[in-house]
Interface confidence: medium
């Protein structure tokens, strides 16, 4: 019996087609992805093959103006239209709190939404009961397939799930649910979840009875053969893991942003054992037409976004590099722009002793979600900025001791090189790292811009001095592992909306040209 698994993950609000780097589509003939194009391909496969499942491994939420405006209603509507069979909860599904998940998505989705390792407690338990499930048994042709969901246990550190959801260890939570499916005579089981490729592989190895793992969160691109676009494969598709009980378990992921549709064919024997697995992600490029009906629907929903998207805020005459490849590894000019805007927004309280009350900015590189291409006539719109800063956060003012800042910068590079989000972009700070040293001892120079001075200059950080710093509320709340900020901050004042801060700055400057200038070495 053959099953076709179609899968997406980390779509991040890319409902419309995008450019090759998943930013706003400029040249339609070269654009990719989007739900209208995805629907065309999905329906083509559904017509051609008898046993097809369409699955999503989480993080539909967050990423463009669509989420900023519609707050998840767009996810439910278009996933319903595409007739997804199941979805796993990702960490970003909690970005607007639990209410922002329940109302627009959980109550509106016409497909099961899954996570076995999220347990509700307190008053939330009855409110959310049945709205998401640990697993679902789905009819596929004349057979039965069990789908069991999981979500990153790091979600409380990455998003806003509140205090009434407990995120358990994925493997510990999955095993009893898989066992339950086995007692129900379900012998074909897919683990669908959002914890990253390393955890996906661990689930394949450790959870007895899981036949296939469909993952997300790490934006992992797997491919067998010559890859069709810019993404470099992290391994073959599917990636085969040998389980502890000796089975070959295929693990798949489909990069991100709806650029690819994962396509995996699994052959099962009559006892539900995987005999063979093969496939590849399908690049959703312009050779696949956009479905006219879905496209019309997109255009109808788009009307509400036009106030956001059409107004030019200012121009850039340089490429604004907001790519993960840059901002999570080194100083990037998008990070510099944002930090400069954050400081500019806080230009106040000057007197004869202080040129400004605050001179420093830190910004987690993982919070920068998109580049802006200057070749679109240099135009910068609200929509461009919403793709860069999609989280709807605020830029806040905190007071920290120098010793806390030093810990933060050590944390910034404690696991450098893994494309994790905690790498800090800065303003009013010069930092030098020595990555050959052991984690926790890599900051060799940390100079900060003085405030109590008529001519601003950089002085060494003093461990016992108290400094004001502008940073995203995400960091002030200990996000991306910056627990030391949350635990040790001396004062926290919430600030202005992040996109508004940057848009105001760009409007004020009219033309921008931020550089990489040696803030981070």
């Amino acid at each position: 019996w053959e099953l076709t698994i179609l899968h997406t993950n980390d779509v991040h609000s890319r409902l419309e087609q995008t450019s090759e780097d998943s930013s706003k589509c400029v040249n339609a003939s070269r654009c990719m992805g989007g739900v209208a194009r995805l629907f065309t391909k999905v329906q083509q496969i559904r017509r051609a093959e008898p046993n097809v499942l369409l699955l999503d491994a989480g993080d539909q939420y967050q990423g463009t103006i669509w989420f900023t405006v519609y707050k998840g209603a767009e996810v439910a509507h278009f996933m319903n239209a595409l007739r997804y069979d199941a979805m796993a909860l990702g960490n970003h599904e909690f970005d607007n709190g639990v209410e922002g998940l329940i109302e627009p998505l959980l109550k509106e989705a016409k497909f099961p939404i899954l996570s076995a390792n999220i347990k509700a407690k307190g008053p939330l338990a009855s409110q959310i009961s049945g709205l998401y499930l640990p697993y679902k048994v789905l009819p596929v042709g004349d057979e039965v397939v069990g789908i069991v969901g999981y979500t990153s246990k790091e979600t409380p550190f990455l998003s806003n799930p509140g205090t009434n959801l407990v995120f358990e260890d994925e493997i510990t939570a999955l095993q009893p649910e898989v066992d339950k499916l086995k007692t129900l005579n379900v012998n074909k089981i897919i683990a669908l979840g959002h914890s990253g490729f390393e955890t996906d592989k661990l689930i394949a190895q450790k959870v007895r009875g899981v036949d296939v793992v469909v993952g997300g969160h790490s934006n992992t691109f797997l491919y067998t053969g010559n890859p069709p676009s810019k993404e470099v494969p992290a391994g073959k598709y599917p990636f085969i893991v040998t389980s502890d009980d000796g089975r070959k378990v295929p693990v798949v992921q489909a990069y991100a942003f709806g650029k690819y549709l994962g396509y995996l064919k699994i052959e099962f024997d009559e006892r539900g054992n995987v005999i063979s697995s093969h496939g590849n992600p399908i690049l959703l490029n312009s050779s696949i037409p956009e479905d006219p009906s879905i496209k019309a629907d997109i255009n109808k929903w788009r009307i509400k976004l036009d106030n956001y998207s059409t107004q030019e805020l200012g121009k850039t005459i340089v490429y604004l590099d907001g790519s993960s490849q840059s901002c999570r590894f080194r100083e990037c000019n998008m990070g510099n722009l944002i930090c400069d805007a954050m400081i500019n927004n806080n230009l106040r309280h000057a007197d004869e002793m202080f040129w400004n009350h605050v001179s420093m900015c830190i910004l987690n590189g993982g919070g920068i979600r998109s580049p802006i291409d200057e070749r679109n006539n240099g135009t910068i719109t609200w929509e461009n900025l919403a793709a860069v800063l999609p989280f709807g956060g605020t830029f806040d003012l905190v007071q920290l001791k120098g010793s806390t800042l030093k810990k933060a910068f050590e944390h910034s590079v404690h696991r450098y090189g893994q494309s994790t989000g905690e790498f800090l972009q800065v303003g009013g700070i010069h930092v030098v790292y020595d990555l050959s040293r052991k984690p926790g001892d890599r900051v060799v120079k940390l100079d900060v811009l003085c405030t109590k001075c008529r001519v601003p200059s950089y002085d060494p950080l003093k461990m016992d001095e108290i400094y004001k710093v502008i940073l995203p509320n995400f960091l002030a709340n200990g996000g991306d592992g910056f627990q030391m900020i949350k635990d040790e901050l001396l004062r926290h004042d919430s600030g202005d909306q992040d996109i508004n801060v940057v848009s105001t700055y760009i409007s004020k400057m009219k033309v921008i040209y931020p550089a990489v200038e040696g803030r981070i070495k």
């Epitope: 559904r46 497909f111 679902k136 048994v137 009819p139 042709g141």
Partner: antibody
Framework: QVQLVQSGAEVKKPGASVKVSCKAS????????INWVRQATGQGLEWIGW????????KYNEKFKGRVTLTVNTSISTAYMELSSLRSEDTAVYYC??????????????WGQGTTVTVSS | DIQMTQSPSSLSASVGDRVTITCRAS??????LAWYQQKPGKAPKLLLY???TLASGVPSRFSGSGSGTDYTLTISSLQPEDFATYYC?????????FGGGTELEIK
């Protein structure tokens, strides 16, 4: 309110074809499958097939394959069922029904009033 | 194809009675089962889905149970408006077949 309104009764000769319409209102027509079910006088219900209005995707009961054609006109939110090569045993009330798919748990939640098709020489 | 067999085919009862109708599938339908009520000359009306979930607006005297191949519709206390024909339907593999119906009449 949500409703499905079907066309009027039809009398046909054996070998002819019949086309029954089902007009939807009160909801987004393209978001739900339309199913067709028939019921011979004094008999039970028999599922014929469904169509997904958004793109015309269809699934038929093998028993009717080749004789039944399901179509839609989304501009007027109307679904059609055409049955050809009619025989006397096709005499029945034909219903359209909307299939809800909430959370993967399926059911027919809204039904048309039914269209009586009589096949007689 | 999965066949659905309903029993009894007809049933006489009085107002206030507790009534049970059963539906047996020829294969496991994994709770993908709906119950409908039909009155003469009218279209069927959804009562329950997912074997046991009450449809919107349906009185709580109606309940469903079962799993695998055997399912039950129970009316805890018959009301005059409940006299009708009842059908089960599975949504497992197509074709989605209905049971033959159970006619509930006044004793």
């Amino acid at each position: 309110q949500v409703q499905l309104v079907q066309s009027g009764a039809e009398v046909k000769k054996p070998g002819a074809s019949v086309k029954v319409s089902c007009k939807a209102s009160g909801y987004t027509f393209t978001s739900y499958d339309i199913n067709w079910v028939r019921q011979a006088t004094g008999q039970g219900l028999e599922w014929i097939g469904w169509i997904y209005p958004r793109d015309g995707f269809t699934k038929y009961n093998e028993k009717f394959k080749g004789r039944v054609t399901l179509t839609v006109n989304t501009s007027i939110s109307t679904a059609y069922m055409e049955l050809s090569s009619l025989r006397s045993e096709d005499t029945a009330v034909y219903y359209c029904a909307r299939k809800e798919g909430y959370r993967g748990d399926w059911y027919f939640d809204v039904w048309g009033q039914g269209t009586t098709v009589t096949v007689s020489s | 194809d999965i066949q659905m067999t309903q029993s009894p085919s007809s049933l006489s009862a009085s107002v206030g009675d507790r009534v049970t109708i059963t539906c047996r599938a020829s294969g496991n339908v994994h709770n993908y089962l709906a119950w409908y009520q039909q009155k003469p000359g009218k279209a069927p009306k959804l009562l329950l889905y997912n074997a046991k979930t009450l449809a919107s607006g349906v009185p709580s005297r109606f309940s469903g149970s079962g799993s695998g191949t055997d399912y039950t519709l129970t009316i805890s206390s018959l009301q005059p408006e409940d006299f009708a024909t009842y059908y089960c339907q599975h949504f497992w593999s197509t074709p989605w077949t209905f049971g033959g119906g159970t006619e509930l009449e006044i004793k």
